[in-house]
């Protein structure tokens, strides 16, 4: 209880925080915080490489989907946005920016197009797209 | 700086929080926090009154749209969900659960249907619907 009371004063809260309530983060200012991950949707269209650079400049990476449960807010995302998934032509696998391989049952990959990058679409779908095509993008920062 | 360092220890963070980063909330556990408001999307379909009751039972209200800027995450919401907007037949106005009147230029009201309740749809649209029709819903809690 003490820490909750302390946080109240720290954040200029006048009411005591119920124990079922908690703070989320820390995240960059004005980012979305959900289950202690930080997300931001960027409206300006960039190609995959520029999108990646933009996220990196904000100490983040392009969206990584690692858990349908922890990231269920992504079910309701409208439109299509670059995520950090790329195709490795040498072995045919899909991997994230951090080098980890896409696990089965996380995303449905939809190949309409020639390409080695993927756009995130609602309901955990990944649409293959040419990496040089401009699109909006999602940055993500995992809290420590 | 001190409060950031303190919060690090409080939240078992090993790194110092950059001053550009901040905590969001407090919110009920596993709710989305954005610009110090808390949101949750409920998947089960309920009529407007049941949706309202569900939000109230969680110390929240149905979604209230009060600022396109502070709530720009709503632009990207897929599908249709009950929000806390109701039609007052006596004076023809639309008002929120708290009794405040819907401000101009916040929502585009689309009358597809006879009804006195409204569904939130992406890009700040409100679809008029019969209040007894089951739909998913969005609860919101404004932090103090």
């Amino acid at each position: 209880i003490w820490s909750a009371v302390f946080l109240n004063s720290l954040f200029n809260q006048e009411v005591q925080i119920p124990l079922t309530e908690s703070y989320c983060g820390p995240c960059p200012k004005n980012w979305i915080c959900y289950k202690n991950n930080c997300y931001q949707f960027f409206n300006e269209s960039k190609n995959w490489y520029e999108s990646q650079a933009s996220c990196m400049s904000q100490n983040a990476s392009l969206l990584k989907v690692y858990s349908k449960e922890d990231q269920d807010l992504l079910k309701l995302v409208k439109s299509y946005h670059w995520m950090g998934l790329v195709h490795i032509p040498t072995n045919g696998s899909w991997q994230w920016e951090d080098g980890s391989i896409l696990s089965p049952n996380l995303l449905t990959i939809i190949e309409m197009q020639k390409g080695d990058c993927a756009l995130y679409a609602s309901s955990f779908k990944g649409y293959i797209e040419n990496c040089s095509i401009p699109n909006t993008y999602i940055c993500m920062q995992r809290t420590v | 700086i001190w409060s950031a360092v303190f919060l690090n220890s409080l939240f078992n963070q090993e790194v110092q929080i950059p001053l550009t980063e901040s905590y969001c909330g407090p919110c009920p556990k596993n709710w989305i926090c954005y610009k110090n408001n808390c949101y949750q999307f409920f998947n089960e379909s309920k009529n407007w009154y049941e949706s309202q009751a569900s939000c109230m039972s969680q110390n929240a209200s149905l979604l209230k749209v009060y600022s396109k800027e502070d709530q720009d995450l709503l632009k990207l919401v897929k599908s249709y969900h009950w929000m806390g907007l109701v039609h007052i037949p006596t004076n023809g106005s639309w008002q929120w659960e708290d009794g405040s009147i819907l401000s101009p230029n916040l929502l585009t009201i689309i009358e597809m249907q006879k009804g006195d309740c409204a569904l939130y749809a992406s890009s700040f649209k409100g679809y008029i619907e019969n209040c007894s029709i089951p739909n998913t819903y969005i609860c919101m809690q404004r932090t103090v």
Partner: antibody, heavy 131, light 106 residues
Framework: EVQLVQSGAEVKKPGATVKISCKVS????????MHWVQQAPGKGLEWMGL????????IYAEKFQGRVTITADTSTDTAYMELSSLRSEDTAVYYC????????????????????????WGQGTTVTVSS | SYELTQPLSVSVALGQTARITCGGN??????VHWYQQKPGQAPVLVIY???NRPSGIPERFSGSNSGNTATLTISRAQAGDEADYYC?????????FGGGTKLTVL
């Protein structure tokens, strides 16, 4: 044999709504997306939108956005296309067509969908909009 | 939005080779699909993903795609090949059809 059988011709007044059905047989309904294509008299093909019967997800062409609703009923293996606020320019033949096939065991064990063109089409439904 | 340009009509002598083009900005980076449509009938897929033939489509039908032009080639043209032909691509989360080309076999 794979078949897509569409509902019969319709005559509608301007402002009305039409709903066309497309009943499939000969394959697993949820293994392919379903598309709808419009063809006005003497004109070319125009894609209207698609539905993934597995989860009901839709994508609509900008031209028809807001007026078209595409749905899929997995209990009857039937896809539907509803077009509202009809005008004379909507007088056309409407086709359903399957395309985008499901491969549960794609590379790396991933669930894949591939688009190999619209390989099976319905016979078409003529909609006439006239006052 | 993405535009596909096809010639309105192409004529070919019986037994000769017909080429129908489909122009689009950097179309070579996209998968192109071709459909044949005879009067009063539903379209039929004849080529998918640039150069692949569905089962039941004669070997006389072939496709290529590079740069800004995709091409449908019909060798040893027959009277039964007379039809409208449409190219199609996926762009910006929509399928786009070309305007169609009427093939006449003389």
């Amino acid at each position: 044999e794979v078949q897509l059988v569409q509902s019969g011709a319709e005559v509608k007044k301007p402002g009305a709504t039409v709903k066309i059905s497309c009943k499939v047989s000969g394959y697993t309904f949820t293994d392919y997306y379903m598309h709808w294509v419009q063809q006005a008299p003497g004109k070319g093909l125009e894609w209207m939108g698609l539905v993934d019967p597995e989860d009901g997800e839709t994508i609509y062409a900008e031209k028809f956005q807001g007026r078209v609703t595409i749905t899929a009923d997995t209990s009857t293996d039937t896809a539907y296309m509803e077009l509202s606020s009809l005008r004379s320019e909507d007088t056309a033949v409407y086709y359903c067509a399957r395309g985008i096939a499901r491969y549960p065991n794609g590379p790396g064990g991933l669930l894949y969908y591939y688009y190999y063109g619209m390989d099976v089409w319905g016979q078409g439904t003529t909609v006439t909009v006239s006052s | 939005s993405y535009e596909l340009t096809q010639p309105l009509s192409v004529s070919v002598a019986l037994g000769q080779t017909a080429r129908i083009t489909c122009g689009g900005n950097n179309i070579g980076s996209k998968n192109v699909h071709w459909y044949q449509q005879k009067p009063g009938q539903a379209p039929v897929l004849v080529i998918y993903r640039d150069s692949n033939r569905p089962s039941g489509i004669p070997e006389r039908f072939s496709g290529s795609n590079s740069g800004n032009t995709a091409t449908l080639t019909i060798s040893r043209a027959q009277a039964g090949d007379e039809a409208d032909y449409y190219c199609q691509v996926w762009d910006s989360f929509a399928f786009v059809f070309g305007g169609g080309t009427k093939l006449t076999v003389l």
